[in-house]
């Protein structure tokens, strides 16, 4: 764009060198050219010649007229035809952006990442502005009444050796940009209540040679926490539905779960965990892939045909991936829940 | 860390002027987003106008029109121009560097009085 231009003259815009997207706009040029009396006054956009809705003012001003003008940045300059030059002469040129104001941020979300030390805070910003828009993060005390404010792009991460003189917060988000400003709505939030577990990780996975083989997944964390509810989600990697077991765990030693799988299959395990009791989620760990075992015995077994299910408390259900090519990013689509596991003895995950 | 001092308040009569300054010390200025704010008695603290970007400025709905912007980068300091100022005008203002991802730090103050 043009950002230092040594002008003729004078160049604006009404309503303004930022406006919102769709306006109808006007553009001025004014020469101060010494030694010329301008026979025509010229428009460029984008460094292309205008042709159309171009008014003469006067001797020395003139309009270019743009309906509903859309584009988010044009960058504008004039000329004028001086009688015996053979160049046009540069009047002056001026950056223009069309925008929108911001929608109100939503889903303001705000957890803490045991031992990150921060309380990390999203949100959506809605549709997008075009143009610079700020963020403002407001994190007011419920118990001191203080008021912090911090500026963000997208997301914020407030240290939480700034949060030590209390525990419940209010937090809001504020979009403001140049065409306007707006509010999310506020969030309440005890910060006992928003500390997600340390990542966890299946670490290995073998199968049992046995005349039902068994698949045994050992996964862990570094979580202090004491009381975690987890859930590991298992298919085959040809296949869209995912399987999930729900777990109560305790990372004081390694997790292992024992699951029935088809022989001779590539599977992809994933595990996330929360606090129990709690709304937030871990994201799904990396994907583990593990290959079964091929069938020593001729007996065709079903996953989930007696004689080896027996009902518990646990629960699987199915999931469907909307793409297999993004499997971090899944959807509850099916409400098939099937509770139960095969039995083979004790299977609560004692270590 | 950047020091902020606002000064140029007073009282005035509605429909009356003022020129706020903020002089920035401490700190490389420009790499703040500078905001002014006001605080009524009992109120929040709102935000009157910040800039956004070069040639870009955001004004609340209350002062458009009559609250003028402006910077002089080799003093480092910030102006908030009042015009037309009415009694709902009167507040302490505040101005405030804001930097991405850290606490919005603020000046002590400069006090405006619009009487009717």
């Known amino acids: 764009g043009i950002t230092s231009i040594n002008c003729s003259g004078d160049m604006w815009v009404e309503p303004g060198e930022i406006f919102q997207m769709g306006m109808n706009v006007s553009i001025y040029c004014q020469e101060a050219l010494k030694h010329c009396r301008p026979r025509n006054l010229y428009f460029y956009k984008n460094g292309f010649k205008e042709e159309f809705d171009i008014t003469r003012i006067n001797r020395t001003t003139a309009r270019i007229w743009y309906k509903g003008f859309s584009e988010p940045h044009a960058y504008m300059h004039c000329t004028a035809e001086c009688p015996g030059h053979f160049q046009e002469t540069l009047i002056c040129g001026k950056d223009i952006s069309s925008g929108h104001p911001p929608d109100a941020p939503s889903n303001l979300t705000c957890v803490i990442y045991e031992y990150s030390g921060n309380m990390t805070c999203t949100w959506n910003t809605g549709k997008p502005t075009y143009i610079d828009t700020k963020y403002i993060v407001h994190v007011k005390s419920l118990e001191t009444e203080e008021e912090q404010q911090y500026l963000a792009s997208s997301y914020v991460k407030i240290s939480t050796d700034s949060l030590q003189g209390s525990r419940k917060y209010l937090v809001w988000v504020q979009a403001v940009n140049s065409l306007g400003m707006e509010n999310s709505q506020q969030l309440h939030v005890h910060l006992d209540d928003i500390v997600i577990p340390s990542a966890s990780i299946i670490s290995r996975a073998e199968t049992t040679n046995d005349t039902v083989p068994k698949t045994i997944v050992y996964w862990k964390s570094k979580t202090m926490i004491e009381k975690v509810f987890c859930e590991m989600r298992y298919k085959t990697t040809t296949n869209q539905t995912w399987s999930v077991k729900e777990f109560d765990a305790n990372f004081t030693y390694v997790q292992q779960s024992e699951f029935y799988l088809e022989p001779d299959s590539k599977y992809v395990f994933q595990v996330r965990c929360q606090e129990t009791g709690k709304r937030n989620w871990q994201p799904w760990s990396s994907p583990f892939v593990h290959q079964t075992s091929q069938e020593t015995g001729k007996r065709n077994w079903q996953p989930w045909s007696s004689p080896f299910v027996h009902q518990t408390s646990q629960t699987v259900s199915q999931v469907t991936a909307k793409s297999s090519h993004e499997p971090q990013k899944m959807e509850m689509l099916s409400a098939t829940i099937f509770r139960g596991h095969p039995a083979s003895g004790n299977h609560q995950d004692i270590g | 860390q950047v020091q902020l001092q606002e000064s140029g308040g007073g009282s005035v009569q509605a429909g009356g002027s003022l020129r706020l300054s903020c002089a920035a010390s401490?700190?490389?200025?420009?790499?703040?987003?500078m905001g002014w704010y006001r605080q009524a008695p009992g109120k929040e603290r709102e935000l009157v106008s910040m800039l956004i970007s070069d040639g870009s400025t955001f004004y609340a709905d209350s002062v458009k029109g009559r609250f003028t912007f402006s910077q002089e980068y080799a003093k480092n300091t910030v102006y908030l121009q009042m015009n037309s100022l009415k009694p709902e005008d009167t507040a302490m203002y505040y101005c405030?560097?804001?930097?991405?991802?850290?606490?919005?730090?603020w000046g002590q103050g400069t006090q405006v009085t619009v009487s009717s």
């Open positions: 405030g560097c804001a930097t991405l991802g850290s606490r919005t730090v």
């Open positions: 401490g700190y490389t200025y420009s790499s703040c987003t």
